[in-house]
């Protein structure tokens, strides 16, 4: 959950607890299980290059 | 250019404890995750858990919750398992890895292994 | 837990000769946004395992493309076109759709 006070994260992008900060939903794509991914399932990723493991 | 070494090889008796370090460098360490994979001897890679080192966050397999301790020091760019309650079946080589979760991302990277070796 | 399960167990083989390893994993792997998250790594004697192929069929950084994955959900498999002697070790597939990540149990590929 986003901690309070900080600014909601901008278009394209989702909140990460695991990392504390807002998260491209592109980075789906490399990682899908990632904890703000279930944020991003509404919202169309920005565009991406190159996906590793 | 990115590189993770680990601590150097320990033997230990049964029943002790053991800490193994991680440090990296090349890369901002609380950019990436920090895996740790168990491979005993002749046998195949198993998964430990890993680390947010940037919130110290942790994930683990079931196999090993309450065996390993993920833990990270930002101040040093190191990452450390502890292992616990040490049986000979923990005696193997375990790795630390760099784990992504961006898109741009140029590599993937572990460190050299260090070996455990649980004996009395 | 998703199990990946491999074989042959060993592959003897000639340089020059093509070889091939097959990878079976207990639940799809194709992500719903098309991704198939199955990955190849190579562990040479007293190294670390290095990747190969990351996302069913896309070669890492600096792998010769003798190398080549294909395959389905379930099904994946692995191919030199030519082995060289350097390609000796054990290939291990991988997953990354969801944790814990696994690996399947290994082919060791060895020069006849």
């Known amino acids: 959950e986003q901690a309070p006070g900080t600014a909601p994260c901008s278009r394209g992008s989702s909140w990460s607890a695991d990392l504390d900060k807002c998260m491209d939903c592109a980075s789906c794509r490399a990682r899908p299980h990632s904890d703000f991914c279930l944020g991003c399932a509404a919202a169309p990723p920005a565009p991406f290059r190159l996906l590793w493991p | 250019q990115v590189q993770l070494v680990q601590s150097g090889a320990e033997v230990k008796k049964p029943g002790a404890s053991v800490k193994i370090s991680c440090k990296v460098s090349?890369?901002?360490?609380?950019?990436?995750?920090i895996a740790w994979v168990k491979q005993a001897p002749g046998k195949g890679l198993e998964w430990i858990g890993e680390?947010?080192?940037?919130?110290?966050?942790?994930y683990y397999s079931e196999k090993f919750r309450g065996k390993a301790t993920l833990t990270a020091d930002k101040s040093t760019s190191t990452a450390y398992m502890e292992l616990s309650s040490l049986r000979s079946e923990d005696t193997a080589v375990y790795y630390c890895?760099?784990?992504?979760?961006?898109?741009?991302?140029?590599?993937?990277?572990w460190g050299q292994g260090t070996t455990v070796t649980v004996s009395s | 837990d998703i199990v990946m399960t491999q074989s042959p167990l060993s592959l003897p083989v000639t340089p020059g000769e093509p070889a091939s390893i097959s990878c079976r994993s207990s639940?799809?792997?194709?992500?719903?946004?098309?991704?198939?998250?199955l990955y190849w790594y190579l562990q040479k004697p007293g190294q670390s395992p290095q990747l190969l192929i990351y996302?069913?069929?896309n070669l890492a950084s600096g792998v010769p493309d003798r190398f080549s994955s294909s395959g389905s959900g379930t099904d994946f498999t692995l191919k030199i076109s030519r082995v060289e002697a350097e390609d000796v070790g054990v290939y291990y597939c991988?997953?990354?759709?969801?944790?814990?990540?696994?690996f399947g149990g290994g082919t060791k590929v060895e020069i006849k």
């Open positions: 996302q069913m069929s």
């Open positions: 890895a760099r784990r992504t979760i961006y898109y741009d991302y140029d590599g993937d990277y």
């Open positions: 991988a997953h990354n759709l969801e944790l814990p990540w696994t």
């Open positions: 680390i947010y080192p940037g919130t110290g966050r942790t």
């Open positions: 090349g890369y901002t360490f609380t950019d990436f995750i």
């Open positions: 639940k799809s792997l194709l992500h719903s946004n098309g991704i198939t998250y």
